[in-house]
């Protein structure tokens, strides 16, 4: 039961995390105008991975997409790539993990297959979470660098009485959403990997005992899942039994009233 709970919780946490990664990737507030030097601005700027926006104090907002691909900074392209890879891996991981869930029965899928799928999805979630965290961190580093550079240049070349205040950008909400979402996906992935260990059958090896009964030979074979898949070419006079040990969790083949699909 603990393994099912761990797997289910891992799936839910990863699902929330990936939803967060998608949300962060789509959000426009990756960087927002720093209002420290100009708290009374009537025009507020913020930027995302795909477009930049200007919100006027009158309430009107205008957003413009980055319609160039080659003209964009390499770092921004890298962040986009990391986030997209994170989303794709996470989506595949979710798909795999749905079929790996113990509470969902698909045909006569063996527990070893479910264990492998759980591990695969867990690894995918971990990589997805790392991609998101890396993407957000690269962007944050880019912001910090630009922030201090623009601070240094803020009042240079003023010349006369006219003051030109350079717009500085600071961390936007999307960065925090991305960090949290990446962390959740990572945690979900780790939980899936932990659940995989509980799902994997313990292969207890017994000595093969063969005895002859009247007219029929019955072989008791060791090897857990390897003994038979149920689709073997069994001869008429020979029965093959699964002699493997089952864990407490594996006894529950069908969903109980506490497991929801």
């Amino acid at each position: 039961m603990a393994v099912t709970a761990c797997q289910g919780l891992g799936f839910v946490v990863s699902l929330i995390g990936i939803a967060g990664i998608i949300a962060a990737t789509c959000m426009d507030q990756w960087s927002t105008q720093d209002l420290y030097n100009n708290p009374v601005t009537a025009v507020f700027n913020y930027q995302g991975l795909w477009r930049s926006c200007v919100r006027e104090s009158s309430g009107f907002t205008e957003c413009r997409g980055y319609f160039t691909l080659l003209g964009l900074p390499a770092m921004l392209q890298a962040v986009r790539a990391l986030m997209i890879v994170g989303i794709v891996l996470g989506a595949i991981g979710l798909l795999v993990s749905i079929f790996a869930l113990k509470c969902i029965r698909i045909g006569s899928m063996e527990d070893s297959a479910k264990a492998n799928m759980t591990l695969t999805s867990g690894i995918m979630f971990i990589v997805s979470g790392l991609c998101a965290i890396a993407g957000v961190s690269v962007f944050a580093n880019m912001l910090v660098t630009n922030f201090w550079m623009s601070t240094a240049n803020m009042y240079t070349g003023m010349g006369g009485m006219v003051q030109t205040v350079q717009t500085r950008y600071t961390f936007g909400a999307a960065l925090f959403v991305g960090w949290v979402a990446g962390g959740l996906t990572l945690i979900g992935g780790v939980m899936m990997c932990i659940a995989c260990r509980g799902l994997a059958p313990e292969e207890t090896n017994y000595k093969a005992v063969s005895y002859h009964a009247s007219g029929h030979s019955v072989a008791y074979k060791p090897g857990g899942f390897k003994a038979s898949t149920g689709f073997g070419s069994n001869t008429k006079n020979k029965k093959i039994y699964d002699g493997g040990a089952r864990t407490e969790d594996e006894v529950q083949s069908y969903p109980s009233k506490h497991d929801y699909v």
Epitope: Q33, N38, V40, T41, A42, V43, N45, Y46, Q47, S52, C53, V54, E56, S57, S58, G59, F60, E62, R64, V162, Q163, T164, V165, Q166, T167
Partner: antibody
């Protein structure tokens, strides 16, 4: 069509308060900031403050040192501007104006003359 | 506060002539986010409230004749009336729409010679 109709002229004594109203029609009153701008005789226009009728959020010009209070009654689509501790230099025409794209004032009331005299 | 300085104080032109007036701000009104200048021009005729002419330094409001045009960027702006008509006699104000408090210029009075 958009219309902003202001209350009539007022004569006040120094130290008193005045409350000017501005009734809006022809648009969604709650969705646009309403501003108050005054113009003293022979002087430039001076922005006093604004209110967002949707939630009552306000912004004021600090030069008025807290003497201005802007309120609204959304059910009546009316904005109000109250100026307290009146002085003779507060004698001016007071306008309400709708805030629009580009942070400009696209529609103005006809103006309310407030005279402060002892 | 941003100080808006208009010049000249008054301008006398003949009908059909070109009228040009200037507005200078103490700070740049150019927003880097959308590369727009947050400067507005108004026309005020005697006994009337101001009327919006141009916003974003060069965008004409709907219904404004195309003889009115705005130009400039950063701190220096110009309003041009290409061919002055009798109904253009008014005071023209520029406004900072970039930073609170929103401030206005002292105005330029346009008269007919």
């Amino acid at each position: 069509q958009v219309q902003l109709v202001q209350s009539g002229a007022e004569v006040k004594k120094p130290g008193a308060s005045v409350k000017v109203s501005c009734k809006a029609s022809g648009y969604a009153f709650s969705n646009y900031w309403m501003n108050w701008v005054r113009q003293a005789p022979g002087q430039r226009l001076e922005w006093m403050g604004q209110i967002y009728p949707g939630n009552g959020d306000t912004k004021y010009n600090g030069n008025f040192k807290g003497r201005v209070t802007i309120t609204r009654d959304t059910s009546a689509s009316t904005a109000y501007m109250e100026l307290s501790s009146l002085r003779s230099e507060d004698t001016a025409v007071y306008y309400c104006a709708r805030y629009y794209r580009g942070n400009c004032f696209d529609y103005w009331g006809q103006g309310t003359l407030v005279t402060v005299s002892s | 506060d941003i100080v808006m300085t208009q010049s000249p104080d008054s301008l006398a032109v003949s009908l059909g002539e070109r009228a040009t007036m200037n507005c200078k701000s103490s700070q740049s009104l150019l927003n880097s986010g959308n590369q727009k200048n947050y400067l507005t021009w108004y026309q005020q005729k005697p006994g009337q409230p101001p009327k919006l002419l141009i916003y974003w330094a060069s965008t004409r409001d709907s219904g404004v004749p195309d003889r009115f045009s705005g130009s400039g960027s950063g701190t220096d702006f110009t309003l041009t009336i290409s061919s002055v008509q009798a109904e253009d006699v008014a005071v023209y104000y520029c406004q900072n729409a970039y930073t609170y408090p929103l401030t206005f210029g002292g105005g330029t009075k346009v008269e007919i010679k």
